[in-house]
């Protein structure tokens, strides 16, 4: 299937040679090397790791490896003035204080520069007041509180459990509800799997463990001070008051031991239903405030973190293409971690390192890919996808003209149950075909393909005999490439069994306990799942860079467009009277989808039949495939989210991690029954249908015969 003119390896063995060179033992060794000390963005340790990776990628054989630096806004706790939360009595005395740090894991007691748990970009402040428990602080949780329970969060400190949605959305929702502070905590219901011990005896979260993380609402902007443009030496920076996405109220995370002390005293309203109860031995009362005996006690936050413009470093490696050097396939993952990064990101960075080594080995044997492969070790992902976004802003003109695909490589594992893939529909067939050729690492599937075990364990909800592939959302470094630039993107990792494990992410996410030992002892002792992920990510990159015809199938986009149109139409049809009153029609969208389907089908037929030995026609057809994703980009962006420009997909306005289809229409319809001006609201729905229909039709036309 893959071939290349510039090689001394038999073409049909190229992919096999690449895959055979990937070794689990190397991934293990690289993971160990990357996780012995913290690599927080903006620190000397992370700069040193960048230089080490640069040096090793050069040794591996890449043509060039450069550091790309930017000066971006980061956030750190004050070393001499720690952040904490108190319960204070009526005299203002602090009768309980939350912990100042996580108890370090065994073997790491003497490691310096472990950043204590904090919410990055929290403003400073010392608010005090009554507590309100807001469940997950989702949009629907605040609807329940405000509309059904008539509880007012204005002037209150809210406590929310982590999980379900991106923490930045929780903070935004709390701000909109009028809260003056937010406490985030990990409830065992979400971060403690039954029957598993807590670290260091198992992979569960101990009571003193805390999830760090940024609480920005950047909506794809990158560095908050330089939205749209790279944070380079001559950048014009906004004032902090004009910075994009910063929270306006203090926020701090705690573990469940500390949360217990706050929640056990809660009074006021009982929880509205069982979905508001976690696993702590507390009433999960909503409040506001504490119960009877403790009603005079208040909660006080002490937040002293600072925002600082700090230098970050991406590592960019190039393996020049032999035939189409001006076509870029990018494999990127971040390097910065909150602490040791045992899973996030180093389980991904170790896989990238081994992929680079394998490609380098082939190159040293005289092989080159057809297209250029760019490898990236991004910085400051944890602070808002800053490294990848700044680099893409700096190179946007090249990327929009030359970018074929972006494959993301953050954490390789979040479990060890089955494969998880999120990607553009253009890559569905690539992923299916590749996984059919790879061996499954799963117990009970010896001698079977990865496709088979994946399909059995994670079946598609729509198509029998096929695996589930999810929409791309955000919260990772593919965001700028896909949502802003319209470059076909995908990601793959091993995941947990979502049916039996309802906890959010993996329990030790962003805690000090995310160590090498966590992976080596509990998740993947043989590193066989890491190897499988390396084969999937590396195999995708290999095919994208090396196949003569790009491995994109535009017919799969047609199928999902119809599905998404049906879904958004169903949502709208919950308001049949208003649709009639305001003459809302989806005919234009369905017509555009129908046209897209027909044109995509004809294009696919031509793709089978054209003369692949004619380099001009080959390049023309490949360009139509490459630019199809680009055709879904609206240069004006989505309403109030100018850097989310993809009309088919955007991160959900209610959860950055989740992807939403036809997001413009979806947001226009959301909670429309509560809008004060229905005529205006339905007018916006009609405008969004028009934008979507036009975009789908325009994209279809890029696949038509050129003349």
């Amino acid at each position: 299937k893959s071939s290349n003119e510039a090689t001394n390896i038999t073409p049909k063995h190229n992919m096999k040679a690449f895959l055979d060179e990937l070794k689990a033992e190397n991934i293990k060794k690289f993971l160990y090397n990357f996780t012995q000390i913290p690599h927080l963005a903006g620190t000397e340790q992370n700069f040193q790791l960048a230089k080490q990776i640069q040096s090793q990628w050069k040794e591996f054989g890449l043509d060039s490896v450069e550091l790309a630096h930017y000066d971006v806004l980061l956030s750190y706790p004050n070393k001499t003035h720690p952040n904490y939360i108190s319960i204070i009595n009526e005299d203002g005395n602090e009768i309980f204080n939350t912990s100042l740090f996580e108890p370090p894991p065994p073997g790491y007691e003497n490691v310096s520069d472990i950043v204590p748990p904090f919410s990055a970009f929290s403003p400073q402040g010392m608010p005090e007041g009554d507590l309100v428990y807001v469940n997950y602080a989702r949009t629907e949780d605040f609807f329940k509180l405000e509309r059904d329970m008539k509880i007012n969060c204005s002037g209150k400190i809210v406590i929310a459990r982590y999980g379900k949605v991106f923490r930045g959305n929780k903070v935004k929702n709390a701000q909109l509800a009028g809260a003056k502070g937010v406490i985030l905590y990990s409830d065992p219901a979400d971060y403690f799997a039954p029957g598993v011990k807590s670290y260091p005896d198992g992979w569960n979260l101990p009571g003193g463990g805390v999830q760090r993380g940024n609480i920005l609402n950047l909506n794809g902007a990158g560095d908050p001070l330089t939205p749209g443009y790279p944070a380079n030496e001559y950048a014009y920076r906004r004032g902090i008051a004009e910075a994009v996405g910063l929270p306006s109220i203090p926020v701090h995370p705690i573990g469940y031991y500390d949360a217990q002390k706050l929640l056990e005293k809660m009074g006021g309203s009982a929880p509205p239903d069982s979905s508001w109860r976690g696993s702590l031995k507390v009433p999960y009362n909503v409040g506001p405030g504490f119960t009877g005996n403790f009603s005079t006690q208040k909660v006080k936050m002490h937040i002293h973190s600072t925002n600082e413009v700090t230098r970050i470093y991406n590592v960019i490696g190039t393996l020049r293409g032999a035939v189409e050097p001006d076509r870029y396939v990018i494999l990127g993952g971040h390097r910065d971690s909150w602490v040791f990064g045992g899973i996030d990101p180093q389980s991904g960075a170790a896989v990238v390192h081994e992929i680079v080594r394998s490609f380098g080995t082939l190159k040293k044997e005289g092989w080159r890919p057809r297209r250029t492969i760019l490898f990236a070790s991004w910085d400051a992902e944890e602070f808002g996808l800053l490294g990848s976004t700044e680099w893409a802003e700096e190179n946007s003109r090249l990327l929009q003209e030359r970018g074929v695909a972006y494959i993301n490589a953050d954490s390789s594992i979040e479990g060890n149950y089955t494969l998880r893939v999120d990607c553009t529909p253009l890559m569905y067939s690539l992923v299916h075909n590749l996984t059919k050729e790879l061996k499954s690492p799963d117990e009970g599937f010896e001698g079977k393909s990865l496709y088979e075990s994946w399909t059995k364990k994670s079946p598609s909800p729509e198509f029998s005999g096929m695996p589930r592939i999810s929409k791309l959302g955000s919260g990772n470094d593919f965001e700028v490439f896909f949502q802003r630039l319209g470059i076909a993107s995908g990601r793959a990792r091993y995941t947990k069994n979502w049916e039996t494990n309802k906890f959010s992410g993996y329990p030790l996410y962003h805690s000090v306990y995310e160590t090498y030992e966590l992976v080596e002892k509990f998740y993947d002792p043989m590193f066989k799942y890491h190897l499988t992920v390396a084969q999937v990510r590396g195999g995708m990159v290999f095919e994208l860079a090396n196949s003569i015809v790009l491995p994109f199938d535009c017919r799969d986009y047609a199928v999902v467009l119809r599905k998404y149109a049906d879904k958004i139409y169903s949502i709208s049809m919950k308001h049949p009277q208003e649709m009639k009153t305001y003459s809302v029609s989806f005919d234009s969208l369905f017509s555009a989808v129908k046209n897209f389907t027909e044109i995509a089908s004809k294009f696919s037929e031509r793709l089978q039949d054209f003369d692949k030995s004619n380099p001009i026609v080959l390049r023309m057809m490949n360009d139509q495939l490459m630019f199809l994703e680009r055709a879904f980009i609206d240069p004006l962006g989505l309403p109030d989210r100018p850097f989310y420009r993809h009309v088919i997909y955007a991160p959900s306005s209610h959860n950055k991690y989740a992807g939403e289809s036809f997001p413009g229409i979806y947001d226009a319809l959301f909670d429309i029954e509560s809008k004060v001006d229905p005529s205006k609201a339905w007018g916006e729905v009609k405008r969004q249908i028009y934008v979507a229909a036009f975009t789908v039709q325009a994209a279809a036309e890029t696949l038509s015969e050129v003349a």
Partner: antibody, heavy 120, light 111 residues
Framework: QVQLVQSGAEVKKPGASVKVSCKAS????????INWLRQAPGQGLEWMGG????????NYAQKFQGRVTLTIDTSTSTAYMELSSLRSEDTAVYYC?????????????WGQGTLVTVSS | DIVMTQSPLSLPVTPGEPASISCRSS???????????LHWYLQKPGQSPQLLIY???NRFSGVPDRFSGSGSGTDFTLKISRVEAEDVGVYYC????????FGGGTKVEIK
């Protein structure tokens, strides 16, 4: 490892008071409540009260209200139980026990016990 | 207070044979969070009590798998699948859903 070490046996006269200590080690003292229980000779276990080292909050069994005082010294990770107005029926082994936090919410570690004998 | 009633008071057993102890509470032990905080302790002769089973059915660290707990609401059972000589002592059920209380104990002894 978690350890609770109690003070030694005491012999008291009726009407006197006794103060038993319980020194904790091997864990973060402020995260776990300390319970006090007693066991009269040949009898079962009876809960007397509990104290939260994190915030000093105290709960007493109704039976002992006004006669028992629970305190803590966080600087030495030590809990204390003082029982006043002793009578002969207070002769018992007194135990401190750590109240396991999630996922146990049970008394997961016990002191060795302190025998208090009330006799004239 | 919740009253915990254990039966039997005394249980003579043969090593290798199973044993079962019953515990009944005067009211439901289901907490508002849905959990049931019913626990079992063993007090070996001359020792402090030790936790065996927490929240009805979960074995505490180091407890052999011959011990199992079950039940719901107000009725609970501790089972020993094959009694060993080291299992002798007094077994107590206890609840911590409300103010902690204990059963009167069941003395397990070798026949």
């Amino acid at each position: 490892q978690v350890q609770l070490v109690q003070s030694g046996a005491e012999v008291k006269k009726p009407g006197a008071s006794v103060k038993v200590s319980c020194k904790a080690s091997g864990y973060t003292f402020t995260y776990f409540d300390i319970n006090w229980l007693r066991q009269a000779p040949g009898q079962g276990l009876e809960w007397m009260g509990g104290i939260s080292p994190g915030d000093g909050n105290v709960n007493y069994a109704q039976k002992f209200q006004g006669r028992v005082t629970l305190t803590i010294d966080t600087s030495t990770s030590t809990a204390y139980m003082e029982l006043s107005s002793l009578r002969s029926e207070d002769t018992a082994v007194y135990y401190c026990a750590r109240d396991g936090n999630f996922p146990y919410y049970a008394m997961d570690s016990w002191g060795q016990g302190t025998l208090v004998t009330v006799s004239s | 207070d919740i009253v915990m009633t254990q039966s039997p008071l005394s249980l003579p057993v043969t090593p290798g044979e199973p044993a079962s102890i019953s515990c009944r509470s005067s009211q439901s032990l289901v907490h508002s969070n849905g959990q049931t905080y019913l626990h079992w302790y063993l007090q070996k002769p001359g020792q402090s009590p030790q936790l065996l089973i927490y929240t009805v059915s979960n074995r505490f660290s180091g407890v052999p798998d011959r011990f199992s707990g079950s039940g719901s609401g107000t009725d609970f059972t501790l089972k020993i699948s094959r009694v060993e000589a080291e299992d002798v002592g007094v077994y107590y059920c206890s609840q911590s859903t409300h103010v902690p209380t204990f059963g009167g104990g069941t003395k397990v002894e070798i026949k």
